[in-house]
Amino acid sequence: LCQGSNYSTCASCPSCPDRWMKYGNHCYYFSVEEKDWNSSLEFCLARDSHLLVITDNQEMSLLQVFLSEAFCWIGLRNNSGWRWEDGSPLNFSRISSNSFVQTCGAINKNGLQASSCEVPLHWVCKKCPFADQALF
């Protein structure tokens, strides 16, 4: 397994589990079904991953190629400011919002969008690849 936290860069790890996509140095899971934000988070954590934390504009642009108009939950929440689940602030992109009750973050091909956390959306998990796929 990759060493370090869920949020490490894991550059030396080779492969991804079934139904996960390898992109750069990480594995990404794009859900088919829809869940609320908390359930999406639990899904990812149960698979030794986390709701997508985007590190920079480059990663965001690469991922948006695989997205449609449909929104996907990501690991972004508004707790006195927009923060990723690893604790870092959102500082490379703006997020659209229409209401103060929209405190969870989502992404689609057009960018970041706030939403009420209870809304069922697709979601994206991110994790380090495994050295041996049988470990999954």
Partner: antibody, heavy 118, light 107 residues
Framework: QVQLQQPGAEFVKPGASVKLSCKAS????????IHWMKQRPGQGLEWIGN????????NYNEKFKNRATLTVDTSSSTAYMQFRSLTSDDSAVYYC???????????WGQGTLVTVSA | NVLTQSPAIMSASPGEKVTMTCRAS???????LHWYQQKSGASPKIWIY???NLASAVPARFSGSGSGTSYSLTISSVEAEDAATYYC?????????FGGGTKLEIK
């Protein structure tokens, strides 16, 4: 497609109560806030309150808090607003509306015209 | 947060440019300031959201701008079908509030 269906009209006597319905279809009812608005003839819109059907938690405009009660029946995907102690000032069109992720209140019912008259 | 719209009623000829304003009693995030169009006998429709984003199917002659306590809706070249009442609304806190509306009449 998302639809909010409201009855066209209700006639009530002063001092009585009325329970207005808003039947939702075309989406997961428990996942989006339902708002209620009042509009007197020729006047502007007033927000009465909202309810989140998934948990039945709600918020009220202080002006209406003592006389309005918002409830839902998730089995029939219907939101209700009960209004008590009606007077002629309550004669108005009452709208329900649903929020969304991108646009704030893109879905509105057709409104129920409540007439309070002896 | 009280929203005050002006003018209450305005009249314009087809092709004219018109601007209506919405002033808030306290600052509103531009994300949370929206405009609705309501035609006689119909339900309101979301028209411009988050200050400047046109709702789907809204003609490009409409635009919105503003920040803080002052917002506006502009129609670059009015058409007959724009006759309606326009309401601003804030979603920055409870209670949600609407402005009193600006009724646009076409000459």
């Amino acid at each position: 497609q998302v639809q909010l269906q409201q009855p066209g009209a209700e006639f009530v006597k002063p001092g009585a109560s009325v329970k207005l319905s808003c039947k939702a279809s075309g989406y997961t009812f428990t996942s989006y806030w339902i708002h209620w608005m009042k509009q007197r003839p020729g006047q502007g819109l007033e927000w009465i309150g909202n309810i989140y059907p998934g948990r039945s938690n709600n918020n009220y405009n202080e002006k209406f808090k003592n006389r309005a009660t918002l409830t839902v029946d998730t089995s029939s995907s219907t939101a209700y607003m009960q209004f008590r102690s009606l007077t002629s000032d309550d004669s108005a069109v009452y709208y329900c509306a649903r929020d969304a992720t991108v646009e704030p209140l893109p879905y509105w019912g057709q409104g129920t015209l409540v007439t309070v008259s002896a | 947060n009280v929203l005050t719209q002006s003018p209450a009623i305005m009249s314009a000829s087809p092709g004219e440019k018109v601007t209506m304003t919405c002033r808030a009693s306290s600052s509103v995030s531009s994300n949370y300031l929206h405009w609705y169009q309501q035609k006689s006998g119909a339900s309101p429709k979301i028209w411009i959201y988050s200050t400047s984003n046109l709702a789907s199917a809204v003609p490009a002659r409409f635009s919105g701008s503003g920040s803080g306590t002052s917002y506006s809706l502009t129609i670059s070249s009015v058409e007959a079908e724009d006759a309606a009442t326009y309401y601003c609304q804030q979603y920055s806190g409870y209670p949600l509030t609407f402005g009193g509306g600006t009724k646009l009449e076409i000459k």
